[in-house]
Structure formats: structure tokens, C-alpha cells
């Protein structure tokens, strides 16, 4: 009888099925929807989380101006195809043979086409801008306290290396968190900024992906930080390819 059998759950992903039937009675966890093995010592990839979600029962200006190439996830949820390592496949198609290309965070980066559409490579999202508006408070938060708290959150809760949190901007009531991670910077074992941003997004919405942990309780010097709006912009290493028709619509 092992410790694994007493607590066979996945701390970092509640959307898993776990059983103590791994080698030596170890706990083995697989993602809902895909059945893929999940490493419970780190964040699960966004692709596997989206797939699990779709399989589950239906329930002086200091702020950054997003570049003209920034993408926002307007398409919402879809059931993605993930590769054997749990990353998004570059080309995604729906049940009606409509296909499109996505970036490494699964956001569409081309016009939709048919089965002949080619997506040569999975383009990396290297810069993520998380734009938050907090609920009214008695006064503004202290910028350096806010900065420190958000950096601590990404380091401790999401296990994202501090060097990937590029900046925290604040202009009451807007907070912007910039995450940057080039292909060359990401070492084996590093949490991906796309995965960290997705966990954060779900936490902010009160839909924590962590097993058995309470929801996110963000406080700055004891003062609750309550978010009322979230927008996330994704910047890819190669700009997206949309037709002019979409850009002028």
C-alpha cells in the first residue's frame, strides 16, 4: 500500500482520470478526452485542457498598445487536435471539413479554408499581453506591491520562471501583464507562457484547473484584487495571415 494509492489525484489538473496502476503502484493520470498521460508536477498543456473541456459534460501613457498583429481569441471553444506531446497541431479542422491554422496557444491565425489548406509549421506565440480591469477600490493599488504580487503568483502558482514575466503595467483600473518567451529561451521543463496564461485566465474566471485548491484569492497588501474584465492578446513570432476582407470588416 503506497502513498500514491492514498492520494491518487493530479494536483495540477482536475480534468484527469487517475488510478494507482502505474509501475510499483504509482499514480498514473490521463487527461479526459484524449486519454494522454499527464505530468502532475507541472501545468498541463492548453491543447489537452481544451480537449478535456470539450469532452466534459456541458456546464504618460504607460499601458501597452497591442500591435496590429496581435490576435484575440474570438473563436471561443473548439475540440482541438493535439500532437503526441500535447501541443496544438498547426492545422485544425471541424466536423464539416472547415480548416484553419493556429498558433502555439491554439488561436486561429489564418482565414478559414477547406481540407486543402496547408499549415506548414506551428507558429510560436512568443508574447502574451494580459489586459485586466479591476473592480473599483478605495484607492489605487501601489504599483510595486501589485507588480510583486503578480510576479509571485506566476512563479508560485503557475511555476513560470520569473524571467518570462517581462513587465507589469498599471494605470488604474487597468493592469497589464506581459509574458515573453522566445523559442530559444524555453528550456526543457520550462512552463510555456501560453499554458500559464490559460491557467491564469481560468483562475480569474473562477474556473480553477487545480485539484482541490481553493479558487484564486488575489490580494495586494491584504486588499482584494477583483477582476471584472479580462482581454488577452497573443503575438506570434511570424505575423498572422488574414485577408484584407477580414481586416476591414
Amino acid at each position: 500500500h503506497t502513498a500514491a494509492q492514498d492520494n491518487c489525484t493530479c494536483p495540477t489538473n482536475k480534468m484527469t482520470v487517475c488510478s494507482p496502476d502505474g509501475p510499483g503502484g504509482r499514480c498514473q493520470c490521463r487527461a479526459l478526452g484524449s486519454g494522454m498521460a499527464v505530468d502532475c508536477s507541472t501545468l498541463t498543456s492548453k491543447c489537452l485542457l481544451l480537449k478535456a473541456r470539450m469532452s466534459a459534460p456541458k456546464n504618460a501613457r504607460t499601458l501597452v498598445r497591442p500591435s496590429e498583429h496581435a490576435l484575440v481569441d474570438n473563436d471561443g471553444l473548439y475540440d482541438p487536435d493535439c500532437d503526441p506531446e500535447g501541443r496544438f497541431k498547426a492545422r485544425q479542422c471541424n466536423q464539416t471539413s472547415v480548416c484553419w491554422c493556429v498558433n502555439s496557444v491554439g488561436v486561429r491565425r489564418t482565414d478559414k479554408g477547406d481540407l486543402s489548406l496547408r499549415c506548414d509549421e506551428l507558429v510560436r506565440t512568443h508574447h502574451i499581453l494580459i489586459d485586466l480591469r479591476h473592480r473599483p477600490t478605495a484607492g489605487a493599488f501601489n504599483h510595486s506591491d501589485l507588480d510583486a504580487e503578480l510576479r509571485r503568483l506566476f512563479r508560485e502558482r503557475y511555476r513560470l520562471h520569473p524571467k518570462f514575466v517581462a513587465a507589469v503595467h498599471y494605470e488604474q483600473p487597468t493592469i497589464q501583464i506581459e509574458l515573453r518567451q522566445n523559442t530559444s529561451q524555453k528550456a526543457a521543463g520550462d512552463v510555456d507562457i501560453g499554458d500559464a496564461a490559460y491557467y491564469f485566465e481560468r483562475d480569474i474566471k473562477g474556473e480553477s484547473l487545480f485539484q482541490g485548491r481553493g479558487g484564486l484569492d488575489l490580494r495586494v497588501r491584504g486588499e482584494p484584487l477583483q477582476v471584472e474584465r479580462t482581454l488577452i492578446y497573443y503575438l506570434d513570432e511570424i505575423p498572422p495571415k488574414f485577408s484584407m476582407k477580414r481586416l476591414t470588416a
Partner: nanobody
Framework: QVQLQESGGGMVQVGGSLRLSCAAS????????MSWVRQAPGKGPEWVSY????????YYPDSVKGRFTISRDNAKNTLYLQMNSLKPEDTAVYRC??????????????WGQGTQVTVSS
């Protein structure tokens, strides 16, 4: 880039034997734990053997214990699975996988494309 390439699969009669090989590259094989995982049609993946980095520790589920033997040659970056007394229920695609074992959890993080093993009666 991690690459795992299996070979040695095929069709065999009940009671027969096969030896699978897996050539590994793109990572320090001699310091990696490894597993063989199989997936039968319409079923989920199932690990069938595990070996630690230096080959001193192996594990098998009850379904294959005494029939399957996992081994490795770190000088050749190759993993092996010797399968004896094969049964129809051993029919599946067999993949080698890089694995990780902690005090409480087991996970595979990279897999090969797999080789088909068919046991006919």
C-alpha cells in the same frame, strides 16, 4: 528533438515470441527511465513494462508479468522488449516511451510512432 523509433513487430501465433527494439535519439538516453506502452483498438494506452535509467529496476503489470522482459543497451541507445507466450489479448500497437517515476506518480512524456503486434489463434 526527441526521437523514438520502434521495430520488430509483426504477426505471430498464440504461444509465440517477438522481440521489439526502440532506437532513441535527441536526449541523454542513459539517464532516462523508459517504458513500453501498448494500445489495443478501441482501448486506452496501457504501460506494459518500465525500466530505470541504469537498468537495475524493472516493473510489469500482472497482465504480462513472467512473459515480458524489458532491457536496455545504453551504449547503443536502444530499448528492448522480449515478449514470450503471446496471447490474442496482447494484440496492440506497441510504443516505447520516455518515462518519469516520482515517489507518488508515473508519467510518460515522449512516445514513438509504434509497431503493430498481432497475435492470431
Amino acid at each position: 528533438q526527441v526521437q523514438l523509433q520502434e521495430s520488430g513487430g509483426g504477426m505471430v501465433q498464440v504461444g509465440g515470441s517477438l522481440r521489439l527494439s526502440c532506437a532513441a535519439s535527441g536526449f541523454p538516453f542513459s539517464s532516462a527511465d523508459m517504458s513500453w506502452v501498448r494500445q489495443a483498438p478501441g482501448k486506452g494506452p496501457e504501460w506494459v513494462s518500465y525500466i530505470n535509467a541504469d537498468g537495475s529496476k524493472t516493473y510489469y503489470p500482472d497482465s504480462v508479468k513472467g512473459r515480458f522482459t524489458i532491457s536496455r543497451d545504453n551504449a547503443k541507445n536502444t530499448l528492448y522488449l522480449q515478449m514470450n507466450s503471446l496471447k490474442p489479448e496482447d494484440t496492440a500497437v506497441y510504443r516505447c516511451a520516455r518515462a518519469k517515476l516520482t515517489d507518488t506518480h508515473y508519467v510518460e512524456d515522449y512516445w514513438g510512432q509504434g509497431t503493430q503486434v498481432t497475435v492470431s489463434s
